[in-house]
Interface confidence: medium
Amino acid sequence: SKSSWGLENEALIVRCPQRGRSTYPVEWYYSDTNESIPTQKRNRIFVSRDRLKFLPARVEDSGIYACVIRSPNLNKTGYLNVTIHKKPPSCNIPDYLMYSTVRGSDKNFKITCPTIDLYNWTAPVQWFKNCKALQEPRFRAHRSYLFIDNVTHDDEGDYTCQFTHAENGTNYIVTATRSFTVEEKGFSMFPVITNPPYNHTMEVEIGKPASIACSACFGKGSHFLADVLWQINKTVVGNFGEARIQEEEGRNESSSNDMDCLTSVLRITGVTEKDLSLEYDCLALNLHGMIRHTIRLRRKQPIDHR
């Protein structure tokens, strides 16, 4: 059987789960007693077309309700487990009162008020986040939706819509809550080396240590085959066979400008004359391609103290 829930002293309207697109009449029963539920509106619980209305709902209304669709050649029976809960005393809304989570992104920033289509409601719908009324202009209530401009992770949380159902000249409150989570929309791009500059020459001192950092960015999110590495004379450092020159493992991952970047550091423990004649390539690669920045070393000119 399908489940529906509501809050005490609020309106609750439910549909027959067997209904489909049927236009045949629907009868409702208390399933434990088989007692028929009337269609007269003067009753607090009554049937209207395929809908069962609790105006308002009480905790003792909880139970299993049966609906029967009578068609000329077949009777279809559906069962609905209705639970009416007391209003939570605090702002923490329990899971059993939550409707499905909405996953938003910078492109999808719309929250729909759950079940509202079942009710005879009039705008505006009031919206609350974690029980606080939303008053910032970024939040726009339109019809049964809440639109959020410039969505960020700070907008995640529980959103409650509150509206009024009108029946027989009486207004009833309805509230419904659902979670909103923000999914980062990742993107992958051709790598960009941010440092060192293209065809850069770096000054070093013979006999002294030197280190060159290479950083590249790849987009945002998960990156396939993304790496930053060094080559010396077109040979990867590990195969170059010079113990003085090492590539720093455990590449530093950072995020700049909301982009995912990797850094690899080439360390020379003591620079020799021979190192000045070598070509050092910083390579950044991923699924989309590879980019190379070549760096050369030159001897630092001694400062003239004359």
């Epitope: 790496d227 590495l229 990867v236 590879m290």
Partner: antibody
Framework: QVQLVQSGAEVKKPGSSVKVSCKAS????????ISWVRQAPGQGLEWMGT????????DYAQKFQGRVTITADESTSTAYMELSSLRSEDTAVYYC????????????????WGRGTLVTVSS | EIVMTQSPATLSVSPGERATLSCRAS???????LAWYQQKPGQAPRLLIY???TRATGIPARFSGSGSGTEFTLTISSLQSEDFAVYYC?????????FGQGTKVEIK
């Protein structure tokens, strides 16, 4: 004529590991990327991961992350795929497949396949 | 991940007839990133088409590929006995690279 020659069939116990090899003969191994794709009996193809031997960089499909290791030995033109914590649902034919490099970068379709290695996981 | 859906699951065709196989992606992919493979029982797959419409080396002209966005088609203009096999589409637009579940082309 370039060929990808794979190691022979294996029978493994649940919880153990298997290491399958794929040797490239004829051609420049370092200019390929090698991927591993598996096919369970009567099922479709499932990509597991890829290595670029020239750079020694490998990456994996999320489903296999932490359980699969792909390596390559440029000196012998051989790629390896090791799958650990084997379970019965890992019973499949494991294929190595080549992506060739064009002037710009690798073409990530598979233009050459090994004949496959049947790995049977059974207690 | 991008889900590739092939239809029909099985296609019964007489030799000499035309066969049209369909492949649908769950989201739009650039046509440059779709490949088709042929697989015969007990054999490895063989690349037929890449870039949605370019025939791989040695593939006969009766095989042609077309489509863009989410809808792609492999056409075999006149089926030969050696063409009866399972055909897979694959997207390599974004990882994980994914294959369709295959279409079996059988003799009618």
């Amino acid at each position: 004529q370039v060929q990808l020659v794979q190691s022979g069939a294996e029978v493994k116990k649940p919880g153990s590991s298997v290491k399958v090899s794929c040797k490239a003969s004829g051609g420049t191994f370092s200019s390929y990327a090698i991927s591993w794709v598996r096919q369970a009996p009567g099922q479709g193809l499932e990509w597991m991961g890829t290595i670029i031997p020239m750079f020694g960089i490998a990456d994996y499909a999320q489903k296999f992350q932490g359980r699969v290791t792909i390596t390559a030995d440029e000196s012998t033109s051989t790629a390896y795929m090791e799958l650990s914590s084997l379970r019965s649902e890992d019973t499949a034919v494991y294929y190595c497949a080549r992506s060739s490099r064009s002037s710009s970068w690798y073409n990530w379709y598979f233009d050459l396949w090994g004949r496959g290695t049947l790995v049977t996981v059974s207690s | 991940e991008i889900v590739m859906t092939q239809s029909p699951a099985t296609l019964s065709v007489s030799p000499g007839e035309r066969a049209t196989l369909s492949c649908r992606a769950s989201q739009s992919i650039s046509s440059s990133y779709l490949a088709w493979y042929q697989q015969k029982p007990g054999q490895a797959p063989r690349l037929l088409i890449y870039g949605a419409s370019t025939r791989a080396t040695g593939i006969p002209a009766r095989f042609s590929g077309s489509g863009s966005g989410t809808e792609f088609t492999l056409t075999i203009s006149s089926l030969q006995s050696e063409d009866f096999a399972v055909y897979y589409c694959q997207q390599y637009y974004t990882t994980p690279w994914t294959f369709g579940q295959g279409t079996k082309v059988e003799i009618k």
